[in-house]
């Protein structure tokens, strides 16, 4: 069950999915991976506020036990829901290879 | 790919199953479930250090851009990797009902 | 906190060059895109090109490409923008600025007036 | 490059009532399901200062008041209730596609 998308913080403040420029020395892939320089990393940020894109029954049990509980159980997080893959072109010993990752880059977030 | 399972915080500060327990009332179930009449919630809590149990690349990419933009870019969440079914005797129009959830109790966790 | 510091002004010489800073302070600045936009009197903004300072990896806008040059000094937290053969065209106030999520630049210098006059 | 075409030119508006802006990509500025479309205020002698970031989402410190919304190629900034401190230049920008590019702006005062 995907609850409501209405984020009672305000436009943007709840979980959904965004990018983070990253270059190959910020995610120490320098030295395995030659192409692309650069990555649009899309992630998923934000605050998962009462039944905001709750994932599953799991997390609307979350909800209501940190409702109770806040110094013992956590507010549900935000996470991936699915991936898109991405082709990496990395070094090997005789020259480079193609690689496809399909859990690396988000596609769309929930709560859970 | 699973990453390391020794936690640098001590024990049982990092990621890891926990049972909380919580009554009908406490779950906002009582108007509409019979049994039990209370339940073990099994859910994953505790901190994601650097790669510590990282469900897949994703998780990866976000430990270190963690570390790189720790104010952008939140650190890795504790979630289930996997559940185990729970059934509920449920109260129906015309009496009772066994429902089988697949989705509330974590049996397993990682950092994402 | 936050803070991207920019001198005040410049006033240079056709022909010459000028080298403008930007001190980064209260965040990690290899962390985080540093990015030069410029604006003319009374005129709109025009994006110059942007400088990851943690490789020192830069890109233009084609316009600039021969007009500015974008480094990075770690050590000191600047960035830094070179502007060569100065005409009076090239008379604006030059402002830096900090990419975060989704290409937002959210934090921004006061800005460097660059008066081009003999 | 992605010309981002911004109106009115100009507005007056009334203290309380809602001002609106629209920008219009020549191209679309989505990419993987964002759209990459950014809102700034500036004032006379001042940087300029990020109201909304990826169409929708308010900057850090930004009254409830400011708003945008579109996708694709269509956007718009609204500001409602329109208070004093509003009057400025605004201006659409998009960091979808190197070089990233300004509308031309909008002026907004007080009727």
């Known amino acids: 069950a995907r609850n409501g998308d209405h984020c009672p913080l305000g436009p943007g403040r709840c979980c959904r999915l965004h990018t983070v420029r990253a270059s190959l020395e910020d995610l120490g892939w320098a030295d395995w991976v030659l192409s692309p320089r650069e990555v649009q990393v899309t992630m998923c940020i934000g605050a998962c506020p009462s039944q905001f894109r709750a994932a599953n029954m799991h997390a609307q049990i979350k909800t209501s036990l940190h409702r109770l509980k806040p110094d013992t159980v956590p507010a549900p997080c935000c996470v991936p829901a699915s991936y898109n893959p991405m082709v990496l072109i990395q070094k090997t010993d005789t020259g480079v290879s193609l690689q496809t990752y399909d859990d690396l880059l988000a596609k769309d977030c929930h709560c859970i | 790919a699973r990453n390391g399972d020794h936690c640098p915080l001590g024990p049982g500060r990092c990621c890891r199953l926990h049972t909380v327990r919580a009554s009908l009332e406490d779950l906002g179930w009582a108007d509409w479930v019979l049994s039990p009449r209370e339940v073990q919630v099994t859910m994953c809590i505790g901190a994601c250090p650097s790669q510590f149990r990282a469900a897949n690349m994703h998780a990866q990419i976000k430990t270190s851009l963690h570390r790189l933009k720790p104010d952008t870019v939140p650190a890795p969440c504790c979630v289930p990797a996997s559940y185990n079914p729970m059934v509920l005797i449920q109260k129906t129009d015309t009496g009772v009902s066994l429902q089988t959830y697949d989705d509330l109790l974590a049996k397993d966790c990682h950092c994402i | 906190q936050v803070q991207l510091q920019q001198p005040g002004a410049e006033l240079v010489k056709p022909g010459a060059s000028v080298k403008l800073s930007c001190k980064a302070s209260?965040?990690?600045?290899?962390?985080?895109?540093i990015h030069w936009v410029n604006q003319r009197p009374g005129q709109g903004l025009e994006w110059i090109g942007d400088i990851n300072p943690s490789n020192g990896r830069s890109k233009y806008n084609e316009k600039f490409k021969n007009k500015a040059t974008m480094t990075a000094d770690k050590s000191s937290n600047t960035a830094y923008m070179q502007l060569s053969s100065l005409t009076s065209e090239d008379s604006a106030v030059y402002y830096c600025a900090r990419e975060v999520l989704d290409g937002a630049m959210d934090y921004w210098g006061q800005g460097t007036s660059v008066t081009v006059s003999s | 490059d992605i010309v981002l075409t911004q109106s009115p030119a100009s507005l007056a508006v009334s203290l309380g009532q809602r001002a609106t802006i629209s920008c219009r990509a020549s191209e679309s500025v989505d990419n993987y399901g964002i759209s990459f479309m950014n809102w700034f205020q500036q004032k006379p002698g001042q940087p300029p200062k990020l109201l909304i970031y990826?169409?929708?989402n308010q900057g850090s410190g930004v009254p409830a008041r400011f708003s945008g919304s579109g996708s694709g190629t269509d956007f718009s900034l609204n500001i409602h209730p329109m208070e004093e401190d509003d009057t400025a230049m605004y201006f659409c920008q998009q960091s979808k596609e190197v070089p990233w590019t300004f509308g031309g702006g909008s002026k907004l005062e007080i009727k």
């Open positions: 990826a169409a929708s």
């Open positions: 209260g965040y990690t600045f290899t962390s985080y895109w």
